[in-house]
Amino acid sequence: LKGQEFAPSHQQVYAPLRADGDKPRAHLTVVRQTPTQHLKNQFPALHWEHELGLAFTKNRMNYTNKFLLIPESGDYFVYSQVTFRGMTSECSEIRQAGRPNKPDSITVVITKVTDSYPEPTQLLMGTKSVCEVGSNWFQPIYLGAMFSLQEGDKLMVNVSDISLVDYTKEDKTFFGAFLL
Amino acid sequence: LKGQEFAPSHQQVYAPLRADGDKPRAHLTVVRQTPTQHLKNQFPALHWEHELGLAFTKNRMNYTNKFLLIPESGDYFVYSQVTFRGMTSECSEIRQAGRPNKPDSITVVITKVTDSYPEPTQLLMGTKSVCEVGSNWFQPIYLGAMFSLQEGDKLMVNVSDISLVDYTKEDKTFFGAFLL
Amino acid sequence: LKGQEFAPSHQQVYAPLRADGDKPRAHLTVVRQTPTQHLKNQFPALHWEHELGLAFTKNRMNYTNKFLLIPESGDYFVYSQVTFRGMTSECSEIRQAGRPNKPDSITVVITKVTDSYPEPTQLLMGTKSVCEVGSNWFQPIYLGAMFSLQEGDKLMVNVSDISLVDYTKEDKTFFGAFLL
């Protein structure tokens, strides 16, 4: 009995049939972060819950030290949402005075680190200007896309300012990936 | 001929190979909602189109009475977008007067209901402050992530204010899930 | 040995088992666009990078002339993010004068074109009012959902104003689809 009776004839030899429930998958949820001072041009990585509540890792997808470790090569869908919250930015005062100003901003980056490659690769970026007048503000940035990843790659989520991340609920700020 | 010739040796017995086209899937689209009285701390659920236009349910994934019914246990990708639209909020007047104010907000929650468990579980939340001055406004909130769901679980989409939901186009407000 | 020993008995005959790595997939990334005259009620399509950097097409999913070509019928997850950036809109001046105004807006549409059908179908729309005072602004719109597509369908991303699209980084503006 030939394999091609079960799959189209263009099936690659290196990609055998496999059970879907066996694929590497993770959904990580927010935890309380160290509220570090905002450093210009240096985006800190978030750390995550990997086993309590809605969070899980399975099928050799492991989480360690802010990184999701990719256990096998393939195409992965990678996603994250970060909910930010903050007070009125100084920008608003300048705006009220009628002078244009480069606004404050919030940014999320999903980054890939490959040990054999010196520079991290930015896979996804969501960046938004924030110029609020006279109020507290809060808003999410959502990202998600498919990437070809290699065994041993590591994924992390970086943010422009860790002290603005809403860590209060696991459904507000999260990070995940699954092999397609 | 052994099953493991088609799948890696770590394939679980309980997860047999299966055709992808056979997996439970649904994409639901917005319909005109019944305007409900806005209740503090209680977010109403949206109801949905499940068979006309772009909407569909298949492979035992059913829609009934605002709920998507999960027909088999497994890992699902669940997503929704809700487009909100509204008039200037009171918040803007307070802001114009220069007094800080807790802003109006818009919120979407994807909720899981398990009959055997008394409390619903919030899977995903997108929440955004809205403090617009002197104009109509409109904006989407998008959510999506992977969750381990059980047969019999029910999913719904709740919003902070049903009267602000844009129900005019099926591509603006939608809700879906598929077994991975 | 029967196929149903590997898949549940409700497996459709037309959906044989197949290797996941063999499915049509694409992730396209932004390139510098040709600035087009902004036409009212006509949203221009973006063109994309399909092979350099993070971009790829595989397994008969092809990109040509702004379109992703669907090579086989099935359920696809389709997604895009477009990051917009702009200067203060006129809207802000009108707002400062205290007169309500229909705000400027930014819109992304993922559109399906079927040669046998005269009218394109809007699959997904993200639309947002933009009414910024006294500053440059930037923000992303993210979209993603599952659709039943037919062999020969073509997908494109349209935007309300091509001159506002941030084409500077491949992680900020992108478009993808994969067969589930």
Epitope: V31, R32, T36, H38, M87, S163, T168 | - | -
Partner: antibody, heavy 120, light 107 residues
Framework: QVQLQQWGAGLLKPSETLSLTCAVH????????WNWIRQPPGKGLEWIGE???????NYNPSLKSRVTISLDTSKNQFSLTLTSVTAADTAVYYC??????????????WGQGTLVTVSS | EIVLTQSPGTLSLSPGERATLSCRAS???????LAWYQQKPGQAPRLLIY???SRATGIPDRFSGSGSGTDFTLTISRLEPEDFAVYYC????????FGQGTRLEIK
Amino acid sequence: QVQLQQWGAGLLKPSETLSLTCAVHGGSFSGYYWNWIRQPPGKGLEWIGEINHAGNTNYNPSLKSRVTISLDTSKNQFSLTLTSVTAADTAVYYCARGYCRSTTCYFDYWGQGTLVTVSS
Amino acid sequence: EIVLTQSPGTLSLSPGERATLSCRASQSVRSSYLAWYQQKPGQAPRLLIYGASSRATGIPDRFSGSGSGTDFTLTISRLEPEDFAVYYCQQYGSSPTFGQGTRLEIK
């Protein structure tokens, strides 16, 4: 050595507003959570809420509607306001620093405590 | 919110004996967020153990912590006179909570 010194009115009437301030000496505001915790006489500890250097707050859900925590970074101080007090709010109120590094979090420094009595 | 239940409410022991204090959570708690404090009359609480099992600076090694998930234990291997006080466990999730306390008194 970090020291937290707190002060505020000790005797209030029902429906009045409680106000306490905590000054941080010998340490930075940045990188920590600044908390208020209370202890009714002869009872256990109850967390009230926290603020970080960016001004973001997080409150105990049972007190959220009445609590405001604010900070003044120029003076290295943070403050607690609790509105519409009743006799049930009688307690020793403590300020405390919340320390988080990697995934480990705890209260490492505490103020001396202020007894607030609500009585008509 | 996560409810922490301490037992026993009061523990009567003599100096030199071993004390075992229990803290049970209503749902799983990250071990790294579980701490123990000692409080003496008229004083603020003092950190003893953090991360469920790490001793704070200056805490004698007769104090030890253990446990994970929902069950945590503070052990004082050999009681000294100054150890008689009230002990609280605490979890530092998004909404921190304390146990109701265990009073350790001289028998």
